[in-house]
Interface confidence: low
């Protein structure tokens, strides 16, 4: 079947990185600069993605694969294939239409991206607040007040949570 197809369609013999040139008797021509074809049998090459402005090049375009972009420092990717870059904020902030704003009281954000989320409501699980929340950190819930016998001290607070993406020292 493959042999038959190639007899019928000479373009099927053109490998990735080339295109089937109708202007030259359907011979396989290499993709021009700044274009690529990632599969064989293509009649045109696709224009390479250009990583400009807030985008920067993560992987250069080649004759067989498109360029890949990420975001310049201070920005992070959104969407599949980094179709958008969104401004980073500090921990304890979120991005609004008017720029980075501190999290409101009762909310936190422990990352440079995303939105401020409400502190955990310990009482919903019948627990008490062991460590108060901040703009950057959620509250730490401890045992329920009933679990602490009179005069007993609270349990030792756990070590602070690691920042996302960081391994322990």
């Amino acid at each position: 079947f493959e042999r038959t197809r190639s007899l019928q369609d000479p373009c099927s013999n053109c490998p990735a990185g080339t295109f089937c040139d109708n202007n030259r008797n359907q011979i396989c021509s290499p993709c021009p600069p700044n274009s690529f074809s990632s599969a064989g049998g293509q009649r045109t090459c696709d224009i390479c993605r250009q990583c400009k402005g807030v985008f920067r090049t993560r992987k250069e375009c080649s004759s067989t694969s498109n360029a890949e972009c990420d975001c310049t420092p201070g920005f992070h990717c959104l969407g599949a294939g980094c179709s958008m870059c969104e401004q980073d904020c500090k921990q304890g902030q979120e991005l609004t239409k008017k720029g980075c704003k501190d999290c409101c009281f009762g909310t936190f954000n422990d990352q440079k991206r995303g939105i401020c989320r409400p502190w955990t409501n310990c009482s919903l699980d019948g627990k008490s607040v062991l460590v108060n929340g901040t703009k950057e950190r959620d509250v730490v819930c401890g045992p329920s007040p009933a679990d602490l016998s009179p005069g007993a001290s609270s349990v030792t607070p756990p070590a602070p949570a690691r920042e996302p993406g960081h391994s322990p020292q």
């Epitope: 250009q50 400009k52 402005g53 807030v54 920005f75 959104l78 969407g79 599949a80 179709s83 958008m84 870059c85 969104e86 401004q87 991005l95 239409k97 995303g114 939105i115």
Partner: antibody, heavy 119, light 107 residues
Framework: QVQLVQSGAEVKKPGASVKASCKAS????????IHWVRQAPGQGLEWMGR????????EYAQKFQGRVTMTRDTSTSTVYMELSSLRSEDTAVYYC????????????WGQGTSVTVSS | DIQMTQSPSSVSASVGDRVTITCKAS??????LSWYQQKPGKAPKLLIY???RKVDGVPSRFSGSGSGTDFTLTISSLQPEDFATYYC?????????FGGGTKLEIK
Amino acid sequence: QVQLVQSGAEVKKPGASVKASCKASGFNIQDTYIHWVRQAPGQGLEWMGRIDPANGNSEYAQKFQGRVTMTRDTSTSTVYMELSSLRSEDTAVYYCTTGNLHYALMDYWGQGTSVTVSS
Amino acid sequence: DIQMTQSPSSVSASVGDRVTITCKASQPINTYLSWYQQKPGKAPKLLIYRVNRKVDGVPSRFSGSGSGTDFTLTISSLQPEDFATYYCLQYLDFPYTFGGGTKLEIK
């Protein structure tokens, strides 16, 4: 204030092309994206694509790939959307809309360009 | 493509009623969802972005909520000027996709 003013209504025959314009004022178009959204009579909203006027890069919905071309003229703060091989289903109001660069928001809209495709 | 399924497609309500419109994404869209209001013959108007953030000037009776794939627009007490068609939009990924719309009519 921010304004997007679009070109007037068009009547086209099937197979023809239409080129709608969108002139921006009150902001620098190179600081934003310009999106095009269409709405057929009595139907919902459909995103067609967007252009980054700073560099001319555009992304199109697959449905319109090969038929739509978005361009810009930064000297006149105008963006254009050309749709070719028109068919009756392309009868719609075509809106240009803009949003903050980092949000992909569409918070300012033109008044719309009505395109009627009829033989 | 990410599909946005909006319900109901139409709803009849009276002034003062509480109305809820839902939008379901075919895959998680984080918080990249906005809501638009459109009146006949007019361009859509952005009400809410990033799920729950109101645009300046939008009345407090409008609120948005949800996360992941399920989102809600609530109008706490309908006013005469709220009768319109409402659309959700996901803008996590290309192509951006709108819900089919909810027409809010006077009962």
